[in-house]
Interface confidence: low
């Protein structure tokens, strides 16, 4: 019968050849009476065998990532008679790994949206670095990931890449991020080959902050001749939110002559203030009335951030028109 | 295809123990992450463990801490649930599901059809 | 750990109709979210991940949406095959948690 042990070659070995064990039948006795032949795929380009003594040898340098085993057939024949001495036999050649492929972030570009202010441990995302290297061989393809980049807002599982908050982030403050992903392989340990990705996390907005006046006193004028209905001027408010986050409602908190009235303009986000009962100069020639302004829309658990309202106090002065 | 096949389950009384194990087909099983779930009769769905592909991390449900192990073998492309100091209240239709892939790794998007176990003296 | 609640309990309605399964977290969970439908005497089976992706295979008339701690199934038109417990689950943080499902059934 045939003996042989299990074949391995290491790949990426820089020598010309290199013997990887030895075939043989148990009838050969060593007088050279016997020829071992090589079958299949490599047989002559990449493994030669030694005709005489069954030895395999590798003569070309093996990339394990491009193929990892070879499947291989040998005859022996009796060179005497012709006859094969045994049946012809198949078997395998293992190209063991060495690590020579640093992990890769095959996923690139890596782009994330988190609500500002989600709490710790909410997860991002989740990357994943691929490792040509053998996952069963050593710890060639284990890989483990941490942040380079950052601290201290985020955090990485370092088995599993996933991306988690470690810090609540204010949009209002910086709305996007650059996180830097490290993968090593050999689980760390000296020799390992290491990959990095960057990863934009950007900030959707929450509504975290109120719309506020930017003056604490507006002064405006209105005809007494005005009719109702009529514009006399605006006010202003501004909001650090984005989008509906920053729609704002203005209205009247205050106003004892019930004369004015106040719309909100939702394109420009202004206060209109609006003629609602006509004024007379010489029974009232100047009023004196309060706005506020609330956000649009404003979910219950942000609610701690609207807690009091911003108001302005508007002074109006009313201008004489001649009377016939 | 992806299949998943449940087996290991059946009747135990308290304090007894039962592995179960999920064969597992049709894809590149120490890539992913692998769950057991457990229904109780007429009961909603209750995660039971977690294990990371490759099966450095491991996750239990506080009900099962200390009695219960999970484990894989890549080999075999299994899961499995060793399950000692079994209760009345472990009694459930025991599902194995596999995780899914980025921010879903620890979900999962394929389960098997399940297998009973049955705590009682 | 998060409480996951699910509401209805029970939703009755005829075919055709707009089913709307509401999902609610103790705590913000992000999207971290997926919906799984369930037959009596099956496996459950993934509809929706991520809050609102669709899984591979299932018909565009179900739809996810919300993020944080609200969240929503949507059924547009429900086919007699629709009639199911559906599940809610959070894979944000460990422990993994369940919504305790809603029943949709036939009017």
């Known amino acids: 019968g045939w003996v042989w042990n299990q074949f391995f070659v290491p790949e990426e070995m820089n020598t010309t050849s290199h013997h990887i064990g030895q075939l043989r039948s148990d009838l050969d006795n060593g007088n050279n009476s016997f020829q071992y032949k090589l079958l299949g795929a490599g047989a002559g380009s990449t493994f030669i065998i030694d005709e005489r003594t069954g030895d395999i040898y590798a003569i070309q340098k093996l990339d394990r990532e491009e193929r990892s085993l070879y499947i291989l057939r040998a005859q022996v024949i009796d060179i005497a008679t012709g006859r094969a001495v045994e049946p012809e036999s198949e078997f395998v050649i293992k190209v063991s790994d060495i690590n020579d492929n640093e992990p890769k972030f095959l996923d690139e570009p890596y782009e994330a949206i988190v609500p500002e202010m989600s709490p710790e441990g909410t997860l991002v995302i989740q990357v994943t670095a691929s490792d040509a290297d053998d996952p069963s061989s050593g710890n060639n393809a284990r890989l483990l990931y941490s942040l380079l980049q950052g601290q201290p807002y985020f955090s990485v599982e370092p088995t599993t890449g996933v991306i988690r908050i470690s810090s609540k982030m204010d949009r209002e403050l910086q709305d996007e991020y650059w996180v830097i992903i490290q993968a090593k392989d050999m689980i760390g340990q000296p020799g390992a080959l290491s990959g990095t990705t960057s990863v934009l996390i950007k900030l959707s907005d929450v509504n975290d902050n109120k719309p506020i006046f930017k003056e604490s006193l507006y002064r405006l004028t209105v005809s007494e001749s005005a009719p109702t209905g009529t514009s006399i001027g605006t006010i202003m408010a501004y909001d650090n939110d984005i989008g509906e986050n920053a729609e704002m409602d203005y209205s009247i908190e205050e106003d004892d002559s019930q004369t004015f009235d106040i719309i909100t303009n939702h394109e420009t986000q202004e206060g209109i203030v609006i003629l609602k009962k006509k004024v007379d100069f010489e029974h009232q020639n100047h009023y004196g009335i309060r706005a506020k302004v609330k956000n649009h829309h404003v979910p219950e658990q942000l609610m701690k951030y609207h807690t009091e309202a911003s108001t302005t106090f508007i002074k109006i002065q009313v201008e004489d028109v001649d009377e016939p | 295809e992806v299949q998943l096949l449940e087996s290991g389950g059946g009747l135990v009384q308290p304090g007894g123990s039962l592995r179960l194990s999920c064969a597992a087909s049709?894809?590149?099983?120490?890539?992913?992450?692998m769950n057991w779930v457990r229904q109780a009769p007429g009961k909603g769905l209750e995660w039971v463990s977690t294990?990371?592909?490759?099966?450095?991390?491991?996750y239990y449900a506080e009900s099962v801490k200390g009695r219960f192990t999970i484990s894989s073998d890549n080999s075999k492309s299994t899961l499995y649930l060793q399950m000692n100091s079994l209760r009345a209240e472990d009694t459930a239709v025991y599902h194995c599901?596999?995780?899914?892939?980025?921010?879903?790794?620890?979900?999962?998007?394929?389960w098997g059809q399940g297998t009973t176990v049955t705590v009682s003296s | 750990e998060i409480v996951m609640t699910q509401s209805p309990v029970t939703l009755s309605l005829s075919l055709g109709e707009r089913a709307t399964l509401s999902c609610r977290a103790s705590q913000s969970i992000s999207s971290n979210l997926a919906w799984f439908q369930q037959k009596p005497g099956q496996a459950p089976r993934l509809l929706i991940y991520g809050a609102f992706t669709r899984a591979t295979g299932i018909p565009a008339r179900f739809s996810g949406s919300g993020s944080g701690t609200e969240f929503t199934l949507t059924i547009s038109s429900l086919e007699p095959e629709d009639f199911a417990v559906y599940y809610c689950?959070?894979?944000?943080?460990?422990?993994?948690?369940f919504g305790g499902g809603t029943k949709v059934e036939i009017k």
């Open positions: 599901a596999k995780g899914g892939m980025g921010g879903y790794y620890y979900g999962m998007d394929v």
């Open positions: 294990i990371s592909g490759g099966g450095a991390n491991t």
């Open positions: 689950q959070q894979y944000n943080y460990w422990p993994l948690t």
């Open positions: 049709g894809f590149t099983f120490s890539s992913y992450a």
